[in-house]
């Protein structure tokens, strides 16, 4: 005997207190399948989430992060604290990197300016807290009385971070 | 959606050398950061170290500093984690995961055996 | 770098509250991340930064951190709740990430 929920299509659910009848969901839940036995409480996007799309009784509701903070998580469901590029976000709040280091993103973390002089190279562009130095030919590359900027950058070798 | 899909399981011998990928989609690779978790049989995560991509900075946990190697190749949105002579003890689920702090995508987890 | 001791394992029966510790050395200081793993599967956050809970994770969930202990409450737990849970923290000096050695959450009955 075929069970006569599988006739239930999505936006209701299979009233097992009415005889199988298929019902609407109620108000605020949802089934984007046929033949559900109950509906989903829809998604509500409360404090840092802001509804992208409504709830409706086929499909949930979707959230992203209100302005100044973004998604983390399938479908958004985190919302971590933006900083501006050259912070990055800890437990006090944003803070501006570290001599040295940078971040050119509005999350993350600051990282190391690259240390042109491991590849052999000199800075051609200094480093900011927000940009990272520009690398350009090796000192020996450079015509006689040219010169270069070559402020203390700290190594940056794999494992090191600037302390 | 973004998925991050590693490398399939892998049987070794001791000494033998190992690279296992992580290949991310569906965000921008370059600009997020991507952890290595080890879980030994039976035992609890320890991070093991992380890399931004964008540039391939890299950072390790002392524990482990020295003993693999964390690598990435942002044109094909993958990253690496390899061994130069493994040890019995390496026997382990390797996961990555995009982030530094909060990690809130995970690959499936590579099992990586050294055995004799 | 900072250590992270948790107890091997909680106990709790059905319904009650499951209160899972976390402690370091001024942890309160940085934000205290948590994570459910079942058998066989990755793990999956169920509070970050101290207190807040993704969406899509019941609100028995919550969490707590200040001093040298972070703690991480299930009100009304529920079978479904048995699973490893991992406490982790990022720390600016040494700029890693820690785990706790984890809690195995066993329900009763």
């Known amino acids: 005997i075929q069970d006569s929920c599988s006739n239930c299509p999505a936006g209701t659910f299979c009233d097992n207190n009415r005889s199988q009848i298929c019902s609407p969901c109620p108000p605020n839940s949802f089934s984007s399948a046929g033949g559900q036995r109950t509906c989903d409480i829809c998604r509500q996007c409360k404090g840092v989430f802001r509804t992208r799309k409504e709830c409706s009784s086929t499909s949930n509701a979707e959230c992203d992060c209100i302005s100044g903070f973004h998604c983390l998580g399938a479908g958004c469901t985190m919302c971590e604290q933006d900083c501006k590029q050259g912070q990055e976000l800890t437990k006090k709040g944003c803070k501006d990197c570290c001599f040295g280091t940078f971040n050119d993103q509005k999350r993350g973390i600051c990282r190391p300016w690259t240390n042109c002089s491991l590849d052999g190279k000199s800075v051609l562009v200094n480093g900011t807290k927000e940009r990272d130095v520009v690398c350009g030919p090796s000192p020996a590359d450079l015509s006689p009385g040219a010169s270069s900027v070559t402020p203390p950058a700290p190594a940056r070798e794999p494992g090191h971070s600037p302390q | 959606q973004v998925q991050l899909v590693q490398s399939g399981a892998e049987v070794k011998k001791p000494g033998e050398s190992l690279k296992i990928s992580c290949k991310g989609s569906?965000?921008?690779?370059?600009?997020?950061?991507i952890s290595w978790v080890r879980q030994m049989p039976g035992k609890g995560l320890e991070w093991m170290g992380k890399?931004?991509?964008?540039?391939?900075?890299?950072n390790y946990s002392p524990s482990f500093q020295g003993q693999v190697t964390i690598s990435a190749d942002k044109s094909i949105s993958t990253a690496y984690l390899q061994w130069s002579s493994l040890k019995a003890s390496d026997t382990a689920m390797y996961y990555c995961?995009?982030?530094?702090?909060?990690?809130?995508?995970w690959g499936q987890g590579t099992l990586v055996t050294v055995s004799s | 770098d900072i250590e992270l001791t948790q107890p091997p394992s909680v106990s709790v029966a059905p319904g009650q509250t499951a209160r899972i510790s976390c402690s370091g050395d001024?942890?309160?200081?940085?934000?205290a991340h948590w994570y459910q793993q079942k058998p066989g599967q990755a793990p999956v956050v169920v509070i970050y930064?101290?207190?807040n809970r993704p969406s899509g994770i019941p609100e028995r969930f919550s969490g707590s951190n200040s001093g040298n202990t972070a703690t991480l409450t299930i009100s009304g737990t529920q079978a479904e709740d048995e699973a490893d849970y991992y406490c982790?923290?990022?720390?600016?000096?040494?700029?890693?990430?820690?785990f706790g050695g984890g809690t195995k959450l066993t329900v009763l009955g």
């Open positions: 930064q101290d207190k």
């Open positions: 569906g965000y921008s690779f370059s600009t997020y950061w």
């Open positions: 995961a995009r982030g530094y702090g909060i990690f809130d995508y």
């Open positions: 001024n942890i309160g200081d940085q934000y």
């Open positions: 982790s923290t990022y720390t600016f000096v040494g700029f890693t990430t820690v």
């Open positions: 890399i931004y991509p964008g540039d391939s900075y890299t």
